[in-house]
Interface confidence: low
Amino acid sequence: LNTTILTPNGNEDTTADFFLTTMPTDSLSVSTLPLPEVQCFVFNVEYMNCTWNSSSEPQPTNLTLHYWYKNSDNDKVQKCSHYLFSEEITSGCQLQKKEIHLYQTFVVQLQDPREPRRQATQMLKLQNLVIPWAPENLTLHKLSESQLELNWNNRFLNHCLEHLVQYRTDWDHSWTEQSVDYRHKFSLPSVDGQKRYTFRVRSRFNPLCGSAQHWSEWSHPIHWGSNTSKENPFLFALEAEQKLISEEDLGGEQKLISEEDLHHHHHH
């Protein structure tokens, strides 16, 4: 049975946020093998997945997970009650909202039940491991003839999030991005009425309520403006220009087509 687990790409740098301990042993045996690192992410403070690479074990092993909160009222050791599986082997644990205490030090312990001395403990700051859901309900409205305002919602305490807005027109090679603080709105002061704009937003649990490094997924994009660019030759010309730029980077001396030239070609 393959279970898909929602975890972001990339490793959280938790060197300052946890330590690993392995119980000592007298002889070289399986108990000296290091246990895989546990990675935890709190999804929108609704649930938390703590996962490990089960395939790193020399033989298939159903590792067990225990957890508690250090120096708090919740310091009683708890067993994982909802394991996640990969190829029918435990590869994670899911904790529900009531078991998540963001501002207490979370201690997670992985253990090999066949070798009880083989265990590893990590301490995590959960407020730095929150990943919000993607922003929703993106809306655009005109503030003036040339100014647009983008608004959005988050299914979380907006106060705790910062945001990154990206936008581009159909003529652009890349996104332009702008950081936005906890107030979920963004203004674009100068809009070209002849172009079609695409906007998207992502959010992060930072800096007010935590210092998370991971962003949410991007929102569904929202569009504004003329659709005509989709059918005109300008995009083809831009692609050609991009090829020329690439070739120039490789040492060619081709003349680049300027945007002004492209407009000229397009209108004639």
Epitope: L157, N158, H159, Y182, R183, P207, L208
Partner: antibody
Amino acid sequence: QVQLVESGGGLVKPGGSLRLSCEASGFTFNDFYMTWIRQAPGKGLEWIAYISKSGDKMRYADSVKGRFSTSRDNAKNSLSLQMNSLRAEDTAVYYCARFYGDIWGQGTLVTVSS
Amino acid sequence: DIQLTQSPSFLSASVGDRVTITCWASQDISSFLVWYQQKPGKAPNLLIYAASALQSGVPSRFSGSGSGTEFTLTISSLQPEDFASYYCEQLNNYPWTFGQGTKVEIK
């Protein structure tokens, strides 16, 4: 231990200048927006300035705009407030605080008097 | 600028009393409001952020509610260490502004 420590307060004559410093420790300074807030003797709190994480964006209250400027050195975990053209009404305890006030410095008293 | 008006400005109460302080905003500030406690000679201490979220380490007898233009801070059972001044602050619009404060005194 997470803390902010201000320094640089003192007595200054009207029209004079003063530079306040705020040293941060115990947290990743460049992850946080920072603010300056002041409190005149026996009065309430007044927000006066804000600076973004990278230090590229600043906002000021009208009462200090054009006279005060804030900057930060993330490499040194420090924040500063340069106060010029000081007036008697600038007399107050000045606090630096982490963005929305979860961590405050102990405050430093600035007295503007001839 | 957004004006915040706190009521009352002074409040006399006894240990064990339930105390409510109100903060009115001159325009809608959504939930972008925080509450602080300040004792003489000390820096303010954050109690509540986002109108109703209890700051870590703050006793659960403190609670906040409201959104839009009317907000309240409630102390369910006043303790001796709660005699202090309380301020609301809005973070919805620049410039950020504070209420004038409420001083809670021993009756």
